[in-house]
């Protein structure tokens, strides 16, 4: 059973316990359980997105190593972002209370998608240039071929820079996610400690 589903089952079990099982201070306990669920849900969301960013980052590292692999990598990155968005939407649907980071996460996803779009566009230009260059070299029309090669090199350099920037962006996003999870765990631990009998 997926972890979010287990979370919800646990939450339901806690909420639907018989009244006799609850100690004095019912509203406070309910509030505490609500907070615990909220933080648990936020952690789940953070971890899911963290995984997506890490996978994306791995793909980027491989892409940087070989220009020839760019096209396939962009396809895979697109799939990863798409899967990540699906996972995020599924989690949001099952954890409607988790509003805390939605706006920020949306901006992050948009920023990543925007840069990925730039990479895809640069890749298309690069692929077209390579094809034209191959044709020209085959017909031994070297003058224009050299000019074309310089343009190609400039595009390749630009694409490398875009990928470099994207890798940094993804890394920073990952670390911010890690920081959010770390802070939430600390808050959750404090809540548990506060809930323990004296």
């Amino acid at each position: 059973m997926p972890v979010p589903a287990l979370c919800l089952l646990w939450a339901l079990a806690m909420v639907t316990r018989p009244a006799s099982a609850a100690p004095m201070g019912g509203p406070e306990l309910a509030q505490h359980e609500e907070l615990t669920l909220l933080f648990h849900g936020t952690l789940q969301l953070g971890q899911a997105l963290n995984g997506v960013y890490r996978t994306t980052e791995g793909r980027l590292t491989k892409a940087r190593n070989s220009l020839g692999l760019y096209g396939r990598t962009i396809e895979l990155l697109g799939q990863e972002v798409s899967r990540g968005r699906d996972a995020a939407q599924e989690l949001r649907a099952s954890l409607l209370e988790t509003q805390m980071e939605e706006d920020i996460l949306q901006l992050q996803a948009e920023a990543t998608a925007e840069v990925l779009g730039e990479v895809a566009q640069a890749q298309k230009v690069l692929r077209d240039s390579v094809q034209r260059l191959e044709v020209q070299l085959r017909s031994a029309w070297l003058g224009p071929a050299y000019r074309e090669f310089e343009v190609l090199k400039a595009h390749a350099d630009k694409q490398s820079h875009i990928l470099w920037a994207l890798t940094g962006h993804v890394q920073r996003q990952r670390r911010e996610m890690v920081a959010q999870q770390h802070r939430l765990r600390q808050i959750q631990e404090r809540l548990h400690t506060a809930a323990l009998p004296a």
């Epitope: 940094g168 911010e176 920081a179 770390h182």
Partner: antibody, heavy 120, light 107 residues
Framework: EVQLVESGGGLVQPGGSLRLSCAAS????????MNWVRQAPGKGLEWVSY????????TYADFLKGRFTISRDNAKNSLFLQMNSLRDEDTAVYYC?????????????WGQGTLVTVSS | DIQMTQSPSSLSASVGDRVTITCQAS??????LNWFQQKPGKAPKLLIF???NLETGVPSRFSGSGSGTDFTFTISSLQPEDIATYFC?????????FGQGTKLEIK
Amino acid sequence: EVQLVESGGGLVQPGGSLRLSCAASGFTFNNHEMNWVRQAPGKGLEWVSYISSSGNTVTYADFLKGRFTISRDNAKNSLFLQMNSLRDEDTAVYYCARDHLSGTSPLSYWGQGTLVTVSS
Amino acid sequence: DIQMTQSPSSLSASVGDRVTITCQASQDINNYLNWFQQKPGKAPKLLIFDASNLETGVPSRFSGSGSGTDFTFTISSLQPEDIATYFCQQYENLPYTFGQGTKLEIK
């Protein structure tokens, strides 16, 4: 040239407070996450706190127990660490550190440090 | 927290020697590892990031390798100015944690 200059250290009694500052120059401050790291005399390095580039996300080492607060003023290219309820074991050189230009490593450029001594 | 176990804690070598320091993480940290050099009274200086990437301006005699839990830092030919303490540090997860350091001395 990237420069990070810490200030605000000094001698303080146990239970007292100090506010450390880190003045940044030579780079676009609001593009970079920042951290505080400390080093007790003759000891190893210990991470203290993190703040994201926007300042929206902050977190701290567990041992601080809510005594320290990290903040930043992007308009003034400054990072701060408010330290309250100081203890003897907080005696250390405190460094501010910036992430790598490429975004990869979080602790790439360090200031020269400022010494905080907690003693009665 | 992720523990970083660095060895040896101190090391004595001659100029021109090949020097190797190891760092072991208590769990998988991918390649999220820095190596720092620190001289007395100075701030740590980044030498290697992402386990194997040489920081700009750092001499090529310094190198790093490894991934997962086991990492190695190497000075291919020790120079007098390399006398310092060297630290590894992980940034896979918070809190960021450091090895206890390796103090390098000249024989």
